[in-house]
Amino acid sequence: ARNGDDCPLGPGRCCRLHTVRASLEDLGWADWVLSPREVQVTMCIGACPSQFRAANMHAQIKTSLHRLKPDTVPAPCCVPASYNPMVLIQKTDTGVSLQTYDDLLAKDCHCI
Amino acid sequence: ARNGDDCPLGPGRCCRLHTVRASLEDLGWADWVLSPREVQVTMCIGACPSQFRAANMHAQIKTSLHRLKPDTVPAPCCVPASYNPMVLIQKTDTGVSLQTYDDLLAKDCHCI
């Protein structure tokens, strides 16, 4: 796979980590989350041109078949390779509790 | 998440496993793979409407933010949740070897 910053479509256009600010209302969490009021959501956004950050053999196959049959096989997609944990302080039936979510914030990205 | 077949866009339109027949030439493998001559590539294809087969909390967030900011945040993407191994008989410098690849064929799919 090419270096993560070596995007053939131009700087910042390929699959990489972005941060999107979102309120509890944006996320539909206002009725069950007390804190934080706002989340800096890290997510994977960007194009996956040929072999860019290819996650595995399957991603390489997908690239080849997309080139051959673009109407049938989609290009690889930019998704999280790993996550950073995050805590939410949330309302429950029994009161308030602090819960750790391991799959909420993307840590790094790849194409698959 | 909704049941995998309960696609709001119509039967078979949402994220699911598809099989695509590909020759070694299609895959660019003709010069290093001896067998099989043709691969039934299982891959994940289809739309990811709201909460359909959402892989995790991150996918749910992505759905919410895509609804709010469709130009900034892409919809979740249909990708493999797990893989089936596959054996390739391949050419090596010293002859032929049998190699197992764990990340070649999608086994099931989810949206992320």
Partner: antibody
Framework: QVTLKESGPGILQSSQTLSLTCSFS??????????VSWIRQPSGKGLEWLAH???????RYNPSLKSRLTISKDTSRNQVFLKITSVDTADTATYYC???????????WGQGTTLTVSS | DVVMTQTPLSLPVSLGDQASISCRSS???????????LEWYLQKPGQSPKLLIY???NRLSGVPDRFSGSGSGTDFTLKISRVEAEDLGVYYC????????FGGGTKLEIK
């Protein structure tokens, strides 16, 4: 299971530097939203918040003690440290570390370590 | 700095009675994000403090419903509807909206 444990010298002379360690388990300071505070309590008196360190290494200090305090962390070893320079008898207290979430929420506390400063 | 003033300093009660503790801040503790980060802690003799109430009125999971918090702006109250022996100790209010500060404490004791 979340636990925190403070350790320190026990006794110091006036003008020396106090070094405290908070060793914790059951959570990690790579987790967005979590932090650790140091809080002290002179015998028979109330609680005084000293300093806080967030997961992203942002730090906050009690303004009245800021010039004497340094908080730091070793994420890989699950430890948070506090240094207080130029201690005097007014610093004699039980020192607690506590896990915090966002702007408070101290849901787990250590059992405290006692410091006596002699003149 | 925000000063948190608790009253009374000492609160003698009979078991089964209601107890009410007041906490007043020297300025509004409504954070710029809209949160009012006011908490209540109980410290029993020889123990570390324990969090009871989060953000004015939200009881921590496992805290009995005889504990309730209320208030806004600068005036806050913790009520215990029927005091039990295990409730005795020192109660502290705490604000985390500005530079973090504890109140001076209120000792709940048997009359």
């Amino acid at each position: 299971q979340v636990t925190l444990k403070e350790s320190g010298p026990g006794i110091l002379q006036s003008s020396q530097t106090l070094s405290l360690t908070c060793s914790f388990s059951g959570f990690s300071l790579i987790t967005s939203g979590l932090g650790v505070s140091w809080i002290r309590q002179p015998s028979g008196k109330g609680l005084e918040w000293l300093a806080h360190i967030y997961w992203d290494d942002d730090k906050r200090y009690n303004p009245s003690l800021k010039s004497r305090l340094t908080i730091s962390k070793d994420t890989s070893r699950n430890q948070v440290f506090l240094k207080i320079t130029s201690v005097d008898t007014a610093d004699t207290a039980t020192y607690y570390c506590a896990r915090g979430g966002y702007d408070g929420y101290y849901d787990y506390w250590g059992q405290g370590t006692t410091l006596t400063v002699s003149s | 700095d925000v000063v948190m003033t608790q009253t009374p300093l000492s609160l003698p009660v009979s078991l089964g009675d209601q107890a009410s503790i007041s906490c007043r801040s020297s300025q509004s503790i409504v954070h710029s994000n809209g949160n009012t980060n006011l908490e209540w802690y109980l410290q029993k003799p020889g123990q570390s403090p324990k969090l009871l109430i989060y953000k004015v009125s939200n009881r921590l999971s496992g805290v009995p419903d005889r504990f309730s918090g209320s208030g806004s702006g600068t005036d806050f109250t913790l009520k215990i509807s029927r005091v039990e022996a295990e409730d005795l100790g020192v109660y502290y209010c705490f604000q985390g909206s500005h530079v973090r500060t504890f109140g001076g404490g209120t000792k709940l004791e048997i009359k």
